[in-house]
């Protein structure tokens, strides 16, 4: 059963390592894949002494852990590299960090990337 699913056809693209990888630095990435597979957007970033450094943004292959996520939110507590994925066109344009502990209330740190 799938309820109210949003298709992902394109995602915001960013690659901090664009020169080495020989890609564009930023843009819009069309998401390709098998017809029977879902597609997602992702963002990955680091927090260096309070400063957000985006590592990559783009399309993400069919992954059940990304299903039904309309917003790109990292919930893991203090990860080394932050990661989130979501469904819906350009849903990785904004990403945020809501560390969810089992007992404490989450705190919100929304981020609007400015590569």
């Amino acid at each position: 059963a799938i309820l109210g699913r949003s298709e992902t056809q394109e995602c915001l693209f960013f690659n901090a390592n664009w020169e080495k990888d020989r890609t564009n630095q930023t843009g819009v990435e069309p998401c390709y894949g098998d017809k029977d597979k879902r597609r997602h957007c992702f963002a990955t970033w680091k927090n260096i002494s309070g400063s957000i450094e985006i590592v990559k943004q783009g399309c993400w292959l069919d992954d059940i852990n990304c299903y039904d996520r309309t917003d790109c939110v990292e919930k893991k507590d203090s990860p080394e590299v932050y990661f989130c994925c979501c469904e819906g066109n350009m849903c990785n344009e904004k990403f945020s960090y809501f560390p969810e502990m089992e007992v404490t209330q989450p705190t919100s740190n929304p981020v609007t990337p400015k590569p």
Epitope: D36, R38, D63, K75, K76, E100, M101
Partner: antibody, heavy 118, light 111 residues
Framework: EVQLLESGGGLVQPGGSLRLSCAAS????????MSWVRQAPGKGLEWVSA????????YYTDSVKGRFTVSRDNSRNTLYLQMNSLRAEDTAVYYC???????????WGQGTLVTVSS | QTVVTQEPSFSVSPGGTVTLTCGFN?????????PSWYQQTPGQAPRTLIY???TRSSGVPDRFSGSILGNKAALTITGAQADDESDYYC??????????FGGGTKLTVLG
């Protein structure tokens, strides 16, 4: 420490019903997709069902479609498997497993035995 | 119906190297199927070894490695030890929520 504790297994007659539960702790349950995997005596592992983080998407192996229902209660950190119209071939140890990015099973419970026999 | 195939059994000498493979009936295995590998000893829950083709799970010794060999996923164990004697399962993620297990390989460490 991540813990997954299954319960609800037991002996049931063919055609009967059982509800399995999996109590999760040590991680943010509402942020993880979950799965049920089973293993018949002396046989290999078989994926049974999966459910997305919100419970909005559910998936089943063909042999249990229409008979089994997976659900989750994120406020109780608990995963469920409602099994109806049970058959002898459903006899197995049922494991619940946490699913992480790249759609793999990163943590497993110890399993609960379901025996379908008259 | 997708069928994932593994060698039913395999033997290796202590200290030797063994490569177990995982294929399927409807084409080539690629990284987009997120191949993962699990070890199971009798009476125990499975243990995660490798995910996303070649990433070792935490605490897994570097004797275990994953790859794509030709059109199959592969698990290689180098310097095999007696306690590597177990059943090994691969899983392919077919997309749209569906996972498929291979039939498993029973690995015997000789001696």
């Amino acid at each position: 420490e991540v813990q997954l504790l299954e319960s609800g297994g037991g002996l049931v007659q063919p055609g009967g019903s059982l509800r399995l539960s999996c109590a999760a702790s040590g991680f943010t349950f509402r942020n993880s997709a979950m799965s049920w995997v089973r293993q018949a005596p002396g046989k290999g592992l078989e994926w049974v069902s999966a459910i997305s983080v919100t419970g909005g998407s559910t998936y089943y192996t063909d042999s249990v479609k229409g008979r089994f229902t997976v659900s989750r209660d994120n406020s109780r950190n608990t995963l469920y498997l409602q099994m109806n119209s049970l058959r002898a071939e459903d006899t197995a140890v049922y494991y619940c497993a946490k699913v992480y990015y790249y759609s793999f099973f990163d943590y497993w419970g110890q399993g609960t035995l379901v025996t379908v026999s008259s | 119906q997708t069928v994932v195939t593994q060698e039913p059994s395999f033997s290796v000498s202590p200290g030797g190297t063994v490569t177990l493979t995982c294929g399927f009936n409807s084409g080539s295995v690629s990284t987009s199927y997120y191949p993962s590998w699990y070890q199971q000893t009798p009476g125990q829950a499975p243990r995660t070894l490798i995910y996303n083709t070649n990433t070792r799970s935490s605490g897994v010794p570097d004797r275990f490695s994953g790859s794509i060999l030709g059109n199959k996923a592969a698990l290689t164990i180098t310097g095999a030890q007696a306690d590597d004697e177990s059943d090994y399962y691969c899983v392919l993620y077919m997309g749209s929520g569906i996972h498929v297990f291979g039939g498993g390989t029973k690995l015997t460490v000789l001696g």
